[in-house]
């Protein structure tokens, strides 16, 4: 699987999950989040050659098409597969509020 | 929706479904398929700017991150959303066999 275990410990050139830290204030303009100040969101990057973690029948076909037509602009793309939630704390007036934000952290990628 | 109805009738520069015809023999090397000879597979292409058909909470965050960090390599990617099946006919000896290949035709795209 193209997950953090494999990708963070290798020098994989193809589609893999990469490290990305997002600072809520600086990178998103969200000044009101109290905790955390930011988080390891990660991102997916890398080419999707034929047979590399292909998602659907269509992505297999497209990768094969790409192999036969190397100059074509039609190619599978490296995108998130498994996503995890992130808990945040913010204040509503003086009252702290905890919220679980779904689909915030990329754990693995796929070629789609 | 970034579907064939919208995308094929517009000159949309951003993420949208594009027309692509795949010839089984020429483009994939699949000589054994009797019918059809090829099919309109389509593909997804175009940038994913802020707010453009974003798929998950993560893709919204990434698009926003990209807006604050325009030079970053982390950005959502235009990939298939709705896929449709394709019926094919091939021969096993003299006997024709009909099969429904799932997820073969792109009907719409999303930024993931």
């Amino acid at each position: 699987a193209l997950d953090t275990n494999y990708c963070f410990s290798s020098t994989e050139k193809n589609c893999c999950v990469r490290q990305l830290y997002i600072d809520f204030r600086k990178d998103l303009g969200w000044k009101w989040i109290h905790e955390p100040k930011g988080y390891h969101a990660n991102f997916c990057l890398g080419p999707c050659p034929y047979i590399w973690s292909l998602d659907t029948q269509y992505s297999k076909v497209l990768a094969l098409y790409n192999q036969h037509n190397p100059g074509a602009s039609a190619a599978p793309c490296c995108v998130p597969q498994a996503l995890e939630p992130l808990p945040i704390v913010y204040y509503v007036g003086r009252k702290p509020k905890v919220e679980q934000l779904s689909n915030m952290i990329v754990r693995s990628c796929k070629c789609s | 929706a970034l579907d064939t109805n919208y995308c094929f009738s517009s000159t949309e520069k951003n993420c949208c479904v594009r027309q692509l015809y795949i010839d089984f023999r020429k483009d994939l090397g699949w000589k054994w398929i009797h019918e059809p000879k090829g099919y309109h597979a389509n593909f997804c292409l175009g940038p994913c700017p802020y707010i453009w058909s974003l798929d998950t909470q993560y893709s919204k965050v990434l698009a926003l991150y990209n807006q604050h960090n325009p030079g970053a390599s982390a950005a959502p990617c235009c990939v298939p959303q709705a896929l449709e099946p394709l019926p094919i006919v091939y021969y096993v000896g003299r006997k024709p066999k009909v099969e429904q290949l799932s997820n073969m035709i792109v009907r719409s795209c999303k930024c993931s």
């Epitope: 303009g29 009101w32 204040y91 509503v92 007036g93 003086r94 509020k97 934000l101 | -």
Partner: antibody
Framework: EVQLVQSGAEVKKPGASVKVSCKTS????????MNWVRQAPGAGLDWMGQ????????NYNEMFEGRVTLTADTSTSTAYMELSSLRAGDIAVYYC??????????????WGQGTLVTVSS | DIVMTQTPPSLSVSPRETASISCRAS??????????MHWYLQKPGQSPQLLIY???NLESGVSDRFSGSGSGTDFTLRISRVEANDTGVYYC?????????FGQGTK
């Protein structure tokens, strides 16, 4: 230029619901909280609640809780306020107003033009 | 809930004079070194506009004839060299406690 453009005036029957829209432009919709404030004829301002458009988190004034629903569509940068079980006391101008950005509850630096809701049988 | 009380309810001022409006909160609106008190002006037939942020910070684009002061429970908005264009209803607002609340207005 930041703009908040609200939908037109509405006339509703008692017991019905009304949905007011607030189409925004000129700023990043997913970065700021959107508040809704109402003003009865000749009266002051009442805060109804707020929504964070990026993921739809809401905070409501208990005075309206259960009757008001705030939603947002990030694809069109539009916020919505729906008020149900309308009664004569709900006759007011309803405003959407952007939060200043430093806190969830905050000052409001840009306001829509207001939408008059009339309740009449 | 924090109740905001404005005085006077209405005020008539001659041009070039100074006007003062008071706002008293039913409990302190100070937290983390800030006073969570803001001032707005609603001109006739218009939406409210923010004048002062966090008790004393002038909102961008607002005339420096407007100034705010105070902390804890007592706050004041001053308008120096009053102009006819300053006519309207002035509101104070706190956001230190949920629910956010406004004063009843000073005309």
């Amino acid at each position: 230029e930041v703009q908040l453009v609200q939908s037109g005036a509405e006339v509703k029957k008692p017991g019905a619901s009304v949905k007011v829209s607030c189409k925004t432009s000129g700023y990043t919709f997913m970065t700021y909280w959107m508040n809704w404030v109402r003003q009865a004829p000749g009266a002051g301002l009442d805060w109804m609640g707020q929504i964070f458009p990026a993921w739809g988190s809401t905070n409501y004034n208990e005075m309206f809780e259960g009757r008001v629903t705030l939603t947002a569509d990030t694809s069109t940068s539009t916020a919505y306020m729906e008020l149900s079980s309308l009664r004569a006391g709900d006759i007011a101008v309803y405003y959407c107003a952007r939060g200043y950005g430093n806190y969830a509850l905050d000052a409001m630096d840009y306001w829509g033009q207001g939408t008059l809701v009339t309740v009449s049988s | 809930d924090i109740v905001m009380t404005q005085t006077p309810p209405s005020l008539s001022v001659s041009p070039r004079e100074t006007a003062s409006i008071s706002c008293r909160a039913s409990e302190s609106v100070d937290s983390y070194g800030n006073s969570f008190m803001h001032w707005y002006l609603q001109k006739p037939g218009q939406s409210p506009q923010l004048l002062i942020y966090l008790a004393s910070n002038l909102e961008s684009g607002v005339s420096d004839r407007f100034s705010g002061s105070g902390s804890g429970t007592d706050f004041t908005l001053r308008i120096s060299r009053v102009e006819a264009n300053d006519t309207g209803v002035y509101y104070c607002q706190q956001n230190d406690e949920d629910p956010l609340s406004f004063g009843q207005g000073t005309k």
